[in-house]
């Protein structure tokens, strides 16, 4: 084993960690569990304990990112560098970053949890044998109802264990139809659809109607994603395999390496490769998040690489199902922290432990039996509203900070950022925010802590906006942007990723500009921004005073409220209304007195 120069280590034993964001490759519960198990390897042999927290002052901050992701060590796309970690210390020291251009799994292919069947929700086992053939993705073979299923062991023929894969024919998510499956074909805006669609949405989410006519019934749900058959590379990256598909006149109902000399599995993304030539690579075994995390956490605790090839801290990834820690790893970590203390002898307990609840029984039966139950669904909203997302990571009621005069929004001279979110005005300042609903005698509520509702964010924000269709929240601070969908966060990402050059130091505001489009402001300049593509059109760059004559040129925040544009400078705002394509200043006022209706005392 090797330790870092000067035996860098944590000087306390109760280590905290924060999972800042997630990969889409695995269910969140699986990611949480992989990290917890990885920490448990190290706590089992040392006096260290690991506690999950939900704030950035955790010792170890865990983040998924791609390419340039906010430190000086960019990731390199798929394969190669899988993750990296910093040695113990304050700030970014001790943090662990995982390359989200990898396929994260548990080392044996994509993790696809099943429903119903007879496997108690176990994940698919890829590849699996059915009727003597090998399958590397869910299949509809053996069924007449088109429901995709998989075996949860290596051999369905011998073990008979199966479950149904995520499928819109089985259930939908969120939406307003209680999780009912899609109804195909269905009518939307007078047109007939026989598959999930993104039509009518600007955020790329696939949805369907759960009755034959959306126009009449307005019932819909979002289609589950199928990690097992989402292709990479080829000419259809991100699309789904279509089974069966025709290749050189022959039908394939699973991924194949036919026609390739390198043995890599591929599939067509339409039913006929011969005519459409659309294809991509099928997911590979992926990298075990558990094993890679265990290795990275070794670095985060102070271990350098080992020269022992069997050790977890050896610098090459190797999938193993055995105990990951080698004696060399144990010796190394104990060199830094000592062994785990022997537990105190304890008298036998006299209370009878409560039995855990029995597992709920899923409908059973072989793959030819249609499941008899339907899952329940999440929050509602029309197709244009987007998935509302799970609750925020913080407390269920936002923490109110003890009040002092500066905590009264009416005493704030200049807010960092203001945004209309939902039907309320949110006002941000120094790690806090207030909410305001217009009405006679209403006052701003708060302050609340930004970190409780949006834990990934910095204290100081430059601007915030909500994209109404997808309910995505964009938070800008300096050269970085965070995008929240419910409680899940993408970021921080650099402004370069939005197509804004290095000369753009910050985004000072945003206004809606048509369906799925925004105007982004930075000082005297503005750009048209496509929310779905998350990219500005570089050719759209314009001077603010050309489009909005009469507003100050040194505004520090631009926001939209009640369909009007507000340009803030110092304590004042310039309100702009649009009439027949003309933008005209129709009011100048104080943010506190005129918008928040603060008393003028």
């Amino acid at each position: 084993f090797q330790t870092f120069e000067g035996d860098l280590k944590w000087h306390h034993h109760n280590i905290t960690y924060w999972i800042q964001n997630y990969s889409e490759d695995l269910p969140r519960a699986v990611i949480d569990d992989a990290f917890a198990r990885a920490f448990a390897l190290w706590s089992a042999v040392t006096p260290l304990t690991f506690t999950r927290v939900y704030s950035r002052d955790a010792d170890i901050v865990i983040q998924f990112g791609v390419a340039e992701h906010g430190d000086g060590y960019p990731f390199d796309g798929k394969d190669g560098l899988l993750a990296h970690a910093f040695p113990p210390g304050p700030g970014i020291q001790g943090d662990a970053h995982f390359d989200d251009d990898e396929l994260w799994s548990l080392g044996k292919g994509v993790v696809v949890p099943t429903r119903f069947g007879n496997a108690d929700g176990a994940a698919c086992h890829f590849p699996f044998i059915f009727e003597g053939r090998s399958y590397s993705a869910c299949t509809t073979d053996g069924r007449s109802d088109g429901l995709p299923w998989c075996s949860t062991t290596a051999n369905y023929d011998t073990d008979d264990r199966f479950g149904f894969c995520p499928s819109e024919r089985l259930y939908t998510q969120d939406g307003n139809a209680d999780g009912k499956p899609c109804q195909f074909p269905f009518i939307f805006q007078g047109q007939s659809y026989s598959a999930c669609t993104t039509d009518g949405r600007s955020d790329g989410y696939r949805w369907c109607a759960t009755t034959a006519n959306y126009d009449r019934d307005k019932l819909f749900g979002f289609c589950p994603t199928r990690a097992d058959s989402t292709v990479m590379g080829g000419n259809s990256a991100g699309e789904l395999c279509v089974f069966p598909f025709t290749f050189l006149g022959k039908e394939y109902s699973t991924c194949t390496s036919e026609g390739r000399g390198d043995g890599r599995l591929w599939c067509a993304t339409t039913s006929n490769f011969d005519s459409d030539k659309k294809w991509g690579f099928c997911p590979d075994q992926g990298y075990s998040l558990f094993l890679v995390a265990a290795h990275e956490f070794g670095h985060a605790l102070g271990l350098d690489h080992s020269s022992v090839p069997e050790a977890l801290m050896y610098p090459m990834y190797r999938f193993t199902e055995g105990p990951p820690l080698h004696k060399d790893d144990v010796n190394g970590i104990r060199h830094l922290y000592g062994p785990r203390p022997e537990p105190e002898p304890r008298p036998p307990t006299t209370t009878t432990p409560q039995p855990t609840a029995p597992p709920t029984v899923c409908p059973t039966g072989p793959p030819t039996v249609h499941p008899s139950e339907r899952p329940t669904a999440g929050p509602t909203g029309p197709p244009s509203a987007g998935p509302t997302g799970p609750p925020t990571a913080g407390p269920s009621t936002a923490t109110t900070v003890p009040l002092s005069p500066v905590d009264d929004a009416c005493n704030v001279n200049i807010f960092d950022a203001i945004a209309e979110i939902g039907n309320q005005l949110y006002l941000f300042k120094d790690g806090k925010y207030w909410r305001f609903s217009e009405g006679r005698g209403s006052r701003p509520q708060g302050p609340f802590l930004i970190a409780d509702k949006w834990p990934a964010l910095p204290r100081k924000l430059d601007s915030v906006f909500e994209e109404r269709l997808s309910k995505k929240l964009f938070f800008f601070s300096g050269r970085q942007v965070w995008v929240y969908t419910g409680a899940s966060v993408l970021g921080p990402r650099r402004l370069d990723k939005l197509g804004l050059g290095a000369d753009v130091a910050q985004v000072t505001g945003a206004l809606r500009s048509g369906r799925g489009k925004m105007l982004l402001f930075s000082g005297r300049r503005l750009w048209r921004f496509d929310v779905k593509a998350q990219m500005v059109d570089p050719r759209s760059a314009s001077e603010v005073d050309r489009m909005f004559p009469g507003v100050p040129l040194d505004t520090h925040d631009v926001f939209q409220y009640r369909e009007k544009a507000y340009f803030c400078q110092d304590r004042f705002y310039w309100r702009v209304s649009s009439r027949s394509e003309l933008n005209q200043v129709d009011q100048v006022g104080y943010v506190t007195y005129d918008i928040l209706q603060c008393p003028e005392d």
């Epitope: 000086g72 960019p74 390199d76 796309g77 560098l81 993750a83 990296h84 040695p87 020291q93």
Partner: antibody
Framework: EVQLLESGGGLVQPGGSLRLSCAAS???????SMWWVRQAPGKGLEWVS?????????FYADSVKGRFTISRDNSKNTLYLQMNSLRAEDTAVYYC?????????????????WGQGTLVTVSS | DIQMTQSPATLSLSPGERATLSCRAS??????LAWYQQKPGQAPRLLIY???YRATGIPARFSGSGSGTDFTLTISSLEPEDYAVYYC?????????FGQGTRLEIK
Amino acid sequence: EVQLLESGGGLVQPGGSLRLSCAASGFTFSQYSMWWVRQAPGKGLEWVSVIYSSGGATFYADSVKGRFTISRDNSKNTLYLQMNSLRAEDTAVYYCAKDRAYGDYVGWNGFDYWGQGTLVTVSS
Amino acid sequence: DIQMTQSPATLSLSPGERATLSCRASQSISSFLAWYQQKPGQAPRLLIYDASYRATGIPARFSGSGSGTDFTLTISSLEPEDYAVYYCQQRGNWPITFGQGTRLEIK
């Protein structure tokens, strides 16, 4: 003893091309990221490009993007920089440098070994 | 990109004196800072990495300190061979950037 030896510099006309090489010895070349850093006459240091240990990832300074290509041959312990569409402002001493950090352990920021440099002059 | 500003541009001191060179980053870079020494006609030489760790073979009179945005290179007692140009370099954020250099000359 770690050694880095650059070659391939010289006088070239604007729009021309040159290929620089850097022969490495004394360390496990295939484990480390390698960099090209340049220094215009009488000026400071400017990073040009980096290639990760496996050669699977390359990054470039904005000033050379699209014109320069970094590559490596781990079997020959050699780093390369192919320079096309050269401009007068590319005139500099070009150094290859070894990263102190390696693989997934990040920290130990710094370039612990440098070559002696090779002069590239772009002039008509 | 993060701007690295070194001061002073030139420092004139006599042998035996203490030299203090400053490097300031335009935003926090944690401790991801290195110092290099460059003599005329030679390649740069790593002195300090991660703000405060002396590189192999560097005399104990060289020390580095600081974190976040403000960093210092100190030479406790100048030797004749220490007169050179000194550069700081950050890797707290991508891309890496160098300071413009401080020339240390004999008074």
